[in-house]
């Protein structure tokens, strides 16, 4: 699997999850989240050659098409597969609220 | 929705489904499919700016991050959303077989 265990410990050039830390204030301009100040969101990057963690029958076909037509703009793209939630604390007035923001952290990628 | 109805009738520059015809023999090197000779597979292409058909909370955050950091390599990508099957005819010996190949035709796209 193209997950953090594999990707963070390798020098994989193909589609893999990469490290990205997002600071809510500096990177997004968000003040409303009290805790945490930022988080390891990660992101997906890298080419999707034939048979590399392909998602569907279509992405297999498209990767093979791309193999035969390397100049074509049609190619699978490296996108998140498994996402995890992020617990946050924010305030409504003076009342702290705890919420899980769903689908916030990329754990693995796929070629779609 | 970024589907064939909208995308094929507009000059949309952002993420949208685009027309692509794949000839099984010429484009994939496949001889095993007897009918059809090829099909309209389509593909997804175009940038994914802030709020453009974003798939998850993560892709919204990443698009906003990208808006503030335009040089960053972390950005959502335009990929298939709705896929449809393709009925094919192939031969096993002299016996024709009809099969549905699932997830073969792109009907709509999303930013993931």
């Amino acid at each position: 699997a193209l997950d953090t265990n594999y990707c963070f410990s390798s020098t994989e050039k193909n589609c893999c999850v990469r490290q990205l830390y997002i600071d809510f204030r500096k990177d997004l301009g968000w003040k409303w989240i009290h805790e945490p100040k930022g988080y390891h969101a990660n992101f997906c990057l890298g080419p999707c050659p034939y048979i590399w963690s392909l998602d569907t029958q279509y992405s297999k076909v498209l990767a093979l098409y791309n193999q035969h037509n390397p100049g074509a703009s049609a190619a699978p793209c490296c996108v998140p597969q498994a996402l995890e939630p992020l617990p946050i604390v924010y305030y409504v007035g003076r009342k702290p609220k705890v919420e899980q923001l769903s689908n916030m952290i990329v754990r693995s990628c796929k070629c779609s | 929705a970024l589907d064939t109805n909208y995308c094929f009738s507009s000059t949309e520059k952002n993420c949208c489904v685009r027309q692509l015809y794949i000839d099984f023999r010429k484009d994939l090197g496949w001889k095993w499919i007897h009918e059809p000779k090829g099909y309209h597979a389509n593909f997804c292409l175009g940038p994914c700016p802030y709020i453009w058909s974003l798939d998850t909370q993560y892709s919204k955050v990443l698009a906003l991050y990208n808006q503030h950091n335009p040089g960053a390599s972390a950005a959502p990508c335009c990929v298939p959303q709705a896929l449809e099957p393709l009925p094919i005819v192939y031969y096993v010996g002299r016996k024709p077989k009809v099969e549905q190949l699932s997830n073969m035709i792109v009907r709509s796209c999303k930013c993931s």
Partner: nanobody, 114 residues
Framework: QLQLVESGGGLVQPGESLRLSCAAS????????MAWFRQAPGKQRELVAL???????NYADSVKGRFTISRDNAENTVYLQMTELKFEDTAVYYC????????WGQGTQVTVSS
């Protein structure tokens, strides 16, 4: 029920100014990233300007130096001050709010014509 209501659109001549307003209700406005988008006939909807809850702003290249986005958290309103309007600014302008999910207003027409 969440509502975004735009106002301030109209017919102006090139070089003139307009101020659009978007009043929000039913969301935590002060936490929301607010944005203005526009859609000209036969064109895609495009981002014009956005302002985060931390007052960080971002503008489309075509409006930089002419348009200013601002917000009033006490009034739950976001504004778009448009100056030196051009023919190509003609479009329906939509207000957008993003907090946990995205919300849209119905739009207000801006026409620049001589």
């Amino acid at each position: 029920q969440l509502q975004l209501v735009e106002s301030g659109g109209g017919l102006v001549q090139p070089g003139e100014s307009l101020r659009l307003s978007c009043a929000a209700s039913g969301i935590i406005f002060s936490a929301s990233t607010m944005a203005w988008f526009r859609q000209a006939p036969g064109k895609q909807r495009e981002l014009v300007a956005l302002i985060t809850d931390g007052d960080r702003t971002n503008y489309a290249d075509s409006v930089k130096g002419r348009f200013t986005i601002s917000r009033d958290n006490a009034e739950n309103t976001v504004y778009l001050q448009m100056t030196e309007l051009k023919f190509e600014d003609t479009a329906v302008y939509y207000c957008n709010a993003f907090w946990l999910k995205a919300y849209w207003g119905q739009g207000t027409q801006v026409t620049v014509s001589s």
